[in-house]
Interface confidence: medium
């Protein structure tokens, strides 16, 4: 417990102290006072640096004195031998004897009382930043007029915060400029400007005077900008030296002017303004900026178009333009969207063909469509190949989106039909040297395949069958075969209008118009055994004049049986009309003269004993086209004759191509579109 | 495909606050910025502010400074919104949308009501 | 910020009928105007985007028109599916702001 004062005196004074004694006491006043400690008496071994027997006295670590010996006052008014003065408040004194004293010594007597210290004077630092008052006890700090005492109760500073500025143009200056600014003090001012524009500070080199830096470069007092998470500075020194114009980047700054305790500088002036917010000028190779500026700033908006072939994707859709608008943050709007290039995706695929795996998909890439050659040919012309387009769609060379369409190559046999020998008279043949032969099972009788979903056949074979069974690529029709072949089945049968119903069909003697079209109801895929023939063209060159060799082929009947199970064909010459008109009919069941010729039929046939017969009806009678001798066109279509392995008659195909095409039109399949 | 799911209803009493979250899946958030938009009972749809989750910029309407937060976790693709000081006038469904050009899509929303 | 007014605020129509709603805004938004439909119960969906553009989905018996200021939605035929209400909303620059939406409701 603080006391104010005290005595302290040595272990049995007055008697002699005993050898080998430690003895120490701890004295304290109450804060803000000094002690001063006083001996009236000394009676101590003497030693040198008192190494012996000693009082020490202590003020924390530091020893403030030690004593032995003996002393005697040096003024007859007052009784003190020795004293100590201290601005603290608490002391210890030690008292050491060793093991042995030659004579006898009396130890000591000391005082202590509690004295008022001078704060304001007795300290090398100064406690208070100006005016410093002492009372007993403890001091207080005042501060000059217009100054204010800070929280620390000791240091004075200028009251020069909180004032904030949100006019778009202003001047700030430090305190009393331009006299000296005041010592020890922290300035703090606030610029806040509306959203959307930054805070530009302009410094004149000439209005700066501030206490230079130390040795170390460390500014004794500050001028710092902060903006957000941007400094500007600490800048001192005479002159301003950082940048005459301070763009912050942002609406709010914060200026804060920071002083130590002297110097005579006059300190600063500077002026802002608020700039919009300027944000960057993006130059991009994909898209166009409008208008176009040198500089964009808040509130500027931009319509950004994607350049021919690039697009902005979003969700499930892609737009080639949007606009943009400068934010109050520096920042444009919508800055996610980004012209990419136009993705075509993954090219569709084509029946009867096939399509490249493009390297990639997007904008410009190339892909190629082939078709199934040599089955197969591209309609169009074109050699196939696509790139992708500026919107998004794969086209061709033509720019346009539609699909190749890969169609059958018609006329052409794998093998050509080398029969030398002499249906009846003719040879084996095999189905690759005839892959349009279509085999009817009921009633027993041909046809010629003439496009993936249509077969022509003779009117007279389908007219007692609406559903017809078919067969291709195949040329044997033993049972066992037609079971590995193709079987074709009928959606609808179309017999030609101008085909007269009978009702007997046996007794028949007009075959004028004997043409049908069977519509399949699923399309035929070619091969080696299986393509189409092709229709005669319009011109004249498709007109067949007597001699012009046609093949046909067939299961029909031959000299040696009803039936054929293996394919038979024969070379057969067009003979004039009246040939056919000579031969004697052979049918009890009809009146020979009453037969008709028209100009719907051809005669061929007479040479060799080759010829068409029953089982053979609906076949092709195939002729080289004039304009490409590789390919085959349906020049005939086997019909009817007056007696076998004479001359035949065969429906005049060129006579029905418009009525075979419209057809064929009108019926179309949608999936074939 | 994309998909957002927002966390369940919350009650709160008025003056607490109340944090809603939206998990994005089927794309990355950082490509996109993530908004917040309310609708009280009967009443319109309000934007209340986007953050773009690449930087973590948020920006706010001014009926809802000082008392919103937007924030975004980009490691599990999620995005935040925060509402402060709850007075029964913030009784709304709070949907989640994201947007580059247009809000493609939404949250099924969820319905925050405050009440003492 | 911008004012986004629609009208009518609700309307009553009938099946197979053709719907216009119209939008204001109280200042140019060139074109970054978007239409939203939303079912009770349901988050909003989007029809149209900048202005004029059907998002992918949407049949075509929407249709949005206009630039600067003024703006339609039109339904060329009403289906029963599409009563329901719509909202418009600027996005040229922020706060995005609303309509107050067209209620539209069977007749």
């Known amino acids: 417990e603080p006391t104010m004062y005290g005595e302290i005196l040595s272990p049995n004074y007055p008697q002699a102290y005993p050898s080998e004694v430690e003895k120490s006491w701890d004295i304290e006043v109450p804060e803000g006072y000094g002690i001063h400690l006083y001996f009236t008496h000394l009676d101590i071994e003497l030693s040198e640096n008192c190494a012996y027997d000693s009082v020490q006295i202590m003020s924390g670590d530091i020893e403030e004195g030690r004593l032995c010996g003996q002393r005697t006052s040096n003024n007859p008014h007052s009784p003190i031998v020795e004293e100590f003065q201290v601005p603290y408040n608490k002391l210890q004194v030690i008292f050491k004897s060793d093991f042995s004293n030659e004579e006898r010594f009396t130890g000591f007597a000391a005082y202590y009382v509690a004295t008022d210290i001078n704060e304001c004077t007795d300290f090398v630092d100064a406690p208070c930043s100006h005016f410093c008052n002492n009372f007993i006890g403890g001091y207080f700090c005042s501060c000059p007029p217009e100054y204010f005492l800070h929280d620390d109760m000791k240091n004075c500073g200028v009251n020069c915060s909180g004032d904030v500025f949100t006019a778009l143009i202003g001047e700030i200056a430090s305190p009393n400029y331009p006299k000296p600014y005041p010592e020890n003090s922290r300035c703090e001012y606030q610029i806040r400007l509306e959203k959307g524009f930054q805070v530009v500070v302009t410094v004149r080199r000439e209005d700066f005077d501030v206490e230079p830096a130390d040795s170390e470069g460390n500014c004794l007092d500050s001028l710092v900008f902060v903006a957000g998470d941007q400094q500007f500075g600490p800048y001192c020194g005479r002159g301003f030296p950082g940048p005459l114009n301070i763009e912050t980047k942002s609406n709010a700054l914060d200026i804060i002017f920071q002083t130590d305790l002297t110097g005579q500088n006059k300190g600063w002036k500077l002026r802002y303004h608020g700039d919009p917010m300027p944000c960057p000028k993006e130059e991009t190779p994909t898209s166009v900026w409008e208008p176009a500026k040198a500089k964009y700033v808040f509130r500027d908006v931009v319509r950004i178009t994607c350049l021919d072939g690039f697009e902005v994707v979003e969700g499930r859709v892609g737009a080639t333009s949007f606009h943009s608008t400068c934010q109050s943050n520096g920042k444009w709007s919508n800055s996610k969207l980004k012209c990419q290039p136009v993705d075509c995706g993954i090219p569709e695929s084509i029946e009867n063909g096939k399509v490249e795996d493009p390297e990639s998909t997007l904008f410009g890439s190339v892909t190629r469509y082939t078709c199934e050659e040599p089955y197969y040919y591209m309609e169009n012309g074109g050699n196939g190949q696509y790139h992708c387009a500026s919107n998004g769609s794969w086209v061709n060379e033509a720019l346009s989106p539609e699909l190749p369409k890969c169609v059958p190559v018609c006329g052409v046999p794998r093998e050509p039909f080398e029969g030398k020998q002499r249906i009846i008279g003719g040879s084996d043949a095999d189905i690759k040297n005839f892959p349009w032969q279509v085999f009817f099972d009921n009633p027993w009788a041909g046809g010629a395949l003439i496009d993936e979903y249509w077969v022509l056949t003779a009117a007279h074979v389908v007219e007692g069958n609406q559903e017809p069974t078919m067969y291709v690529g195949s040329t044997s029709v033993q049972t066992s075969r037609l079971a590995k072949s193709k079987m074709l089945t009928s959606e609808r049968v179309f017999i030609h209008p101008g085909w007269k119903l009978l009702e007997v069909p046996e007794a028949r003697t007009n075959f004028d118009n004997d043409i049908a079209l069977v519509q399949l109801k699923d399309p035929v895929k070619m091969g080696p055994t299986v393509a189409p023939i092709c229709l005669p063209g319009t011109s004249s060159d498709y007109n067949l004049m007597d001699g012009d060799l046609g093949l046909i082929a067939g299961w029909g009947r031959t000299e040696k049986r009803d039936r054929a199970l293996r394919l038979k064909a024969a070379r057969l010459p067009v003979a004039p009309l009246r040939k056919c008109r000579e031969v004697k009919v052979e049918n009890p069941k009809a009146d020979a003269g009453a037969y008709v010729f028209t100009p719907n039929m051809i005669c061929a046939g007479g040479e060799k004993g080759m010829d068409s017969c029953k089982g053979d009806s609906g076949g092709a009678f195939a002729v080289q086209d004039p304009n490409d001798k590789a390919k085959f066109y349906v020049a005939g279509l086997v019909s009817w004759g007056p007696q076998c392995g004479t001359y035949g008659l065969y429906t005049r195909v060129q006579n029905y191509v418009d009525w075979i095409k419209k057809t064929m039109q009108e019926n179309s399949t949608p999936s074939k579109d | 495909q994309v998909q957002l799911v927002q966390s369940g209803a919350e009650v709160k009493k008025p003056g607490a606050s109340v944090k809603v979250s939206c998990k994005a899946s089927?794309?990355?958030?950082?490509?996109?910025?993530m908004h917040w938009v309310r609708q009280a009972p009967e009443q319109g749809l309000e934007w209340m502010g986007w953050?773009?989750?690449?930087?973590?910029?948020?920006i706010y309407a001014q009926k809802f400074q000082g008392r919103v937060t937007i924030t975004a976790d980009t490691s599990t693709n999620t995005a935040y919104m925060e509402l402060s000081s709850l007075r029964s006038e913030d009784t709304a469904v709070y949907y989640c949308?994201?947007?580059?050009?247009?809000?493609?899509?939404w949250g099924q929303g969820t319905l925050v009501t405050v009440s003492s | 910020d911008i004012q986004m007014t629609q009208s009518p605020k609700s309307l009553s129509a009938s099946v197979g009928d053709r719907v216009t709603i119209t939008c204001r805004a109280s200042q140019d938004v060139r074109t970054a105007l978007d239409w939203y439909q939303q079912k009770p119960g349901q988050s909003p969906k989007l029809l149209i985007y900048?202005?004029?553009y059907r998002y992918s989905g949407v049949p075509s018996r929407f249709s949005g028109s206009g630039s600067g200021t003024d703006f339609t939605l039109t339904i060329s035929s009403l289906q029963p599916e599409d009563f329901a209400t719509y909202y418009c909303?600027?996005?040229?620059?922020?706060?995005?702001?609303f309509g107050q939406g067209t209620k539209l409701e069977i007749k």
């Open positions: 953050i773009d989750p690449e930087n973590a910029d948020a």
């Open positions: 900048s202005a004029s």
């Open positions: 909303q600027q996005q040229y620059t922020t706060p995005y702001t």
């Open positions: 089927g794309f990355n958030i950082k490509e996109y910025y």
């Open positions: 949308a994201r947007s580059r050009l247009f809000f493609a899509y």
